[in-house]
């Protein structure tokens, strides 16, 4: 039950600064152990935010949030479970919702690497 951690990412993944009123999708994934679990939980600041059944034959589980407001700002992580067997928490992703619209300019260079999006915590 140790080993790899679940992963957490966000789409649209151009920024962790989210404009108020928009929608975001948080994606939890657990590529090598997904089939061991039947529930996935999205936590915000250490408490349950959303929870749902996992989908068989998939390794990713999506949570759509929105339209967002400032109360969505916080630290998010994913946990997989089956009964009382819970995975480790994923690393933590910090989301910030801002009031004004953000003008987003594409970053130069390749855009496939989104690892910079993750804000790592102590977990």
């Amino acid at each position: 039950q140790e080993g790899s951690l679940p992963d957490i990412t966000i789409f649209p993944n151009s920024s962790l600064m989210i404009s108020q009123g928009t929608f975001v999708t948080v994606v939890c994934s657990y590529s090598d152990k997904h089939d061991l679990y039947n529930m996935v939980r999205l936590e915000k600041d250490g408490s349950t935010f959303m929870e749902k059944s996992t989908e068989p034959y998939k390794t990713e589980d999506e949570f759509e949030i929105g339209p967002v407001n400032e109360t969505i700002t916080g630290h998010y992580s994913c946990i997989y479970s089956k009964g009382i067997t819970w995975s480790e928490r994923s690393k933590t992703l910090e989301l910030k919702v801002i009031k004004e619209n953000v003008i987003q300019t594409p970053a130069p260079g390749p855009t496939s690497d989104t690892s910079w999006l993750k804000t790592y915590s102590i977990y």
Partner: antibody, heavy 118, light 107 residues
């Protein structure tokens, strides 16, 4: 044979602290999540806290968040529950439990009584 | 949190009776309901996991059924050693929650 043995209970005044332990044997302790469940006198069962196999992730019921700390020492096969800022409603028998064969609480300790009273 | 409502809270029974108790979840918990037996002065013991699977060594007079929100636990041919409090618990959704218990007493 799987065994879970709790210790460290007693009488404590409101606002004070106590640390209870659970010594495990008969299984590979470091492979399993482990849990604390409590039962107030003449009342039902209530899940309190859980810790993942490595100890990196911990989970608490809302009423004890910020007051209780769960930890484990895999080298000593021991689980701990630190109870701080104790309240009278924390008075209960505290059981450690784990799920080895099923995703349920299939092994329980004998319980340790914690009484919070002035 | 999911609320597990157990009924009845107590039952007066005789040896040899068929005893049935129920547990209702406040929302769908699939088949993730377990049943525990607790005798006076003892720790709880797992009898049934995931609604209907009898735990190792549990006599076949104990059975469980149900899915979704409604679950049933049955003791066929009640024995004196079955006098206890029985609890259901859901583990489908965090946090795990227990029913209030059903106490079996002799008539």
């Amino acid at each position: 044979e799987v065994q879970l043995v709790e210790s460290g209970g007693g009488l404590v005044q409101p606002g004070r602290s106590l640390k209870v332990s659970c010594a495990a044997s008969g299984f590979t302790f470091s492979n399993y999540g482990i849990h604390w469940i409590r039962q107030a006198p003449t009342k039902g069962l209530e899940w309190v806290a859980s810790i993942s196999p490595s100890g990196r992730s911990t989970y608490f019921r809302d009423s004890v968040k910020g007051r209780f700390t769960i930890s484990r020492d895999n080298a000593k096969n021991t689980l701990y529950l630190q109870l701080d800022s104790l309240r009278s409603e924390d008075t209960a028998t505290y059981y450690c439990a784990t799920g080895i064969n099923y995703s349920s609480f299939d092994y329980w300790g004998q319980g340790v009584m914690v009484t919070v009273s002035s | 949190d999911i609320v597990m409502t157990q009924s009845p809270t107590s039952m007066s029974i005789s040896v040899g009776d068929r005893v049935t108790m129920n547990c209702k979840a406040s929302q769908n918990v699939g088949s993730h309901v377990d049943w525990y037996q607790q005798k006076t002065g003892q720790s709880p013991k797992l009898l049934i996991s995931t609604a209907s699977n009898r735990y190792t060594g549990v006599p076949d007079r104990f059975t469980g059924s149900g899915s979704g929100t409604d679950f049933t636990f049955t003791i066929n041919n009640m024995q004196t050693e079955d006098l206890a409090v029985y609890y259901c618990m859901q583990s489908n959704s965090y946090p795990p929650t227990f029913g209030g218990g059903t106490k079996l007493e002799l008539k």
